[in-house]
Amino acid sequence: IVLRPSRVHNSEENTMRALTLKDILNGTFSYKTFFPNWISGQEYLHQSADNNIVLYNIETGQSYTILSNRTMKSVNASNYGLSPDRQFVYLESDYSKLWRYSYTATYYIYDLSNGEFVRGNELPRPIQYLCWSPVGSKLAYVYQNNIYLKQRPGDPPFQITFNGRENKIFNGIPDWVYEEEMLATKYALWWSPNGKFLAYAEFNDTDIPVIAYSYYGDEQYPRTINIPYPKAGAKNPVVRIFIIDTTYPAYVGPQEVPVPAMIASSDYYFSWLTWVTDERVCLQWLKRVQNVSVLSICDFREDWQTWDCPKTQEHIEESRTGWAGGFFVSTPVFSYDAISYYKIFSDKDGYKHIHYIKDTVENAIQITSGKWEAINIFRVTQDSLFYSSNEFEEYPGRRNIYRISIGSYPPSKKCVTCHLRKERCQYYTASFSDYAKYYALVCYGPGIPISTLHDGRTDQEIKILEENKELENALKNIQLPKEEIKKLEVDEITLWYKMILPPQFDRSKKYPLLIQVYGGPCSQSVRSVFAVNWISYLASKEGMVIALVDGRGTAFQGDKLLYAVYRKLGVYEVEDQITAVRKFIEMGFIDEKRIAIWGWSYGGYVSSLALASGTGLFKCGIAVAPVSSWEYYASVYTERFMGLPTKDDNLEHYKNSTVMARAEYFRNVDYLLIHGTADDNVHFQNSAQIAKALVNAQVDFQAMWYSDQNHGLSGLSTNHLYTHMTHFLKQCFSLSD
């Protein structure tokens, strides 16, 4: 299926040009999306191109500038947040990135009623996290690992926690491993729906081993960065959850929420918190061996001022074939009765589907079913449930939005997006206003992305929010590669692949092949999305064929494929890439003497193992910031898929699955190894150990390090990286510069 046909005709050939590397590095062909910042059922805020904060009323079609760019600029604000009572706006400046989600910033509070900044009891700086209560204008913030509360922005703060300490105790914010591998947020505090209570997590990292690496900077002596970072099998953070009454915070103080007995009996994690009402909260817990998850619904006991979590309100989710959930354990979406909920988990056939839980998980009512997967529940209203899935036309790499009418019996299902812009749009997400009165659809491709606004009752399109007209015009004279998404059936396994072909692709000719791989558990690379990136350039200008293959371990095609890699990382992911390459060779247009593979992070691990597979298929390859041994990576992620690196558990496979163990096999390939020295995620240690093993085996290889760069290799390093990799590949494929 050709998704993005090249617009080349003989008459046009002279005016059309190929993509250049410069186009990619300059972001010439980047696209915009439009996510409304909903503030009611029919109003949203948006930051205009000239940096005004504009309020839109959908029903009247009117727009209002509520905060001028002048005010924003006066404090160099890069972000804002309107209080729910619309009295105040916080302005965020001095953004300073920490890890993937976390950053610190300076916050100013602007009073909309008098058009002045709030003076007196100003916020300290830098703040680690700040948010408004869901109602009114209370503020909760985290400063120096402690949580503070303000009843009004101008009031003095009330200090909730006192034990916060850098790298030791974290209150209201996650430590490194919880941020990256469990919560995927910069915060660990949650307001109750009406702002009566504030729940928060406390992470104790006192006993966690520390990763230390040099940050060279430009001083005479490098700094040492220390991060409590539990690697596989190491001591983990100890987590506790507390709830405080924000109306009378000093009355009884924070109350701890009890951990379910079956969880507390051994090492465990807290995985998420969902408020149901002001006096009912739902916590999710996970055993360290991550195949058992417990959802616990707790109620406020007014008489004791405590939180009670009866065993009858504990729901257990267990996997017998792999780990619990997909990448994370899914979170519940509660219905209006405030006790029953909707949740995605595996059905009896091993496909992730929406279930309705009223009393017990055993009695769950399955809402969706089929050999496809429900991916996200967006919103549940009185009469509708909105979700996304990859059901339509049996393409796992698509996402469409569906509505199930839960108010009628039997419930009826409607695909909201399937036929809207069928050729252009096959991969959607959505953003809903209060009560799902309106929603925005954001289409990511395969055509040029487009964001639209819709009526939540009729699904009618109201207006286009962003259609990327400038991008469309800019691409008019570009020879884009062709893209096709197809599947291979091999030994009862379906391998979906995306192939990116040069604009004048001719099946009778031979082309060099580059495999781009990620391949991590519960990932998906073959998606119907738009992208003009490095591999687009390699196909357009350099005449390469690029392929992406989703093998065993990847997501949204059922548990059989997903859990195939359980306790055995580094085996089937590699096998499936190799199998696909052999099939591509059989297609007749691949030059089998010019095949390369590259990947980043988990993809760097897979590409390294593929190069060292001894098949002789690959001439060369690149690993960027690869994992080299699972003993070096984070406990929460690694143990989910590999168990523990102990003799009585899975130490043997931990040892067998390292890149270093295969050092000898790199002798007959050209290998480029790349890593940032300040990678907090996949530590430089991983590449240092590969390099050491290759040197010890007297195997020649190429390497590049990026000083003081993290896992993302951003800024000028990006340009250097892609230029360097381009030269390497062109040399490998004997392409002239």
């Epitope: 009611s40 029919q42 109003e43 309020l55 009323n57 029903e59 009247t60 009117q62 209002y64 509520i66 309107l82 009572d85 619309r86 009295q87 009073d111 909309l112 009623s113 008098n114 058009g115 002045e116």
Partner: nanobody
Framework: QVQLQESGGGLVEAEGSLRLSCIAS????????MGWFRQAPGKERELVAA???????YYADSVKGRFTISRDNARNTVYLQTNSLKPEDTAVYYC?????????????????WGQGTQVTVSS
């Protein structure tokens, strides 16, 4: 509780001006945010301009630069000066009040209303 009474509407030619007034009863006028809404036949009631207790103002983009809202707390009055009027400004103009923030654009969020005054702009 506050009662509102508008005045100053009428028939005016395009590019003309009108000054609408809204007088409020009660001694706590200064504690209310005030707004001017309008409703044309068959259309939603829409916010034109609003002014907070502290005097901050904001406007619908369609009237920005042409209309000015102001308040006189001593006189319990809010004004809407309308200049460079266009035929599409023709509507019934309503004065509204609410406790708290002025930054609400849905008419349902404003509990107190006047009876309205007709503004007709001829071309």
């Amino acid at each position: 509780q506050v009662q509102l009474q508008e005045s100053g509407g009428g028939l005016v030619e395009a590019e003309g001006s009108l000054r609408l007034s809204c007088i409020a009863s009660g001694r706590t006028f200064g504690t209310y945010a005030m707004g001017w809404f309008r409703q044309a036949p068959g259309k939603e009631r829409e916010l034109v301009a609003a002014i907070s207790t502290g005097g901050s103002t904001y406007y619908a983009d369609s009237v920005k630069g042409r209309f000015t809202i102001s308040r006189d707390n001593a006189r319990n009055t809010v004004y809407l000066q309308t200049n460079s009027l266009k035929p599409e400004d023709t509507a019934v103009y309503y004065c509204a009040a609410r406790r708290g923030s002025a930054y609400y654009t849905n008419h349902v969020d404003w509990p107190y209303w006047g009876q309205g005054t007709q503004v007709t702009v001829s071309s």
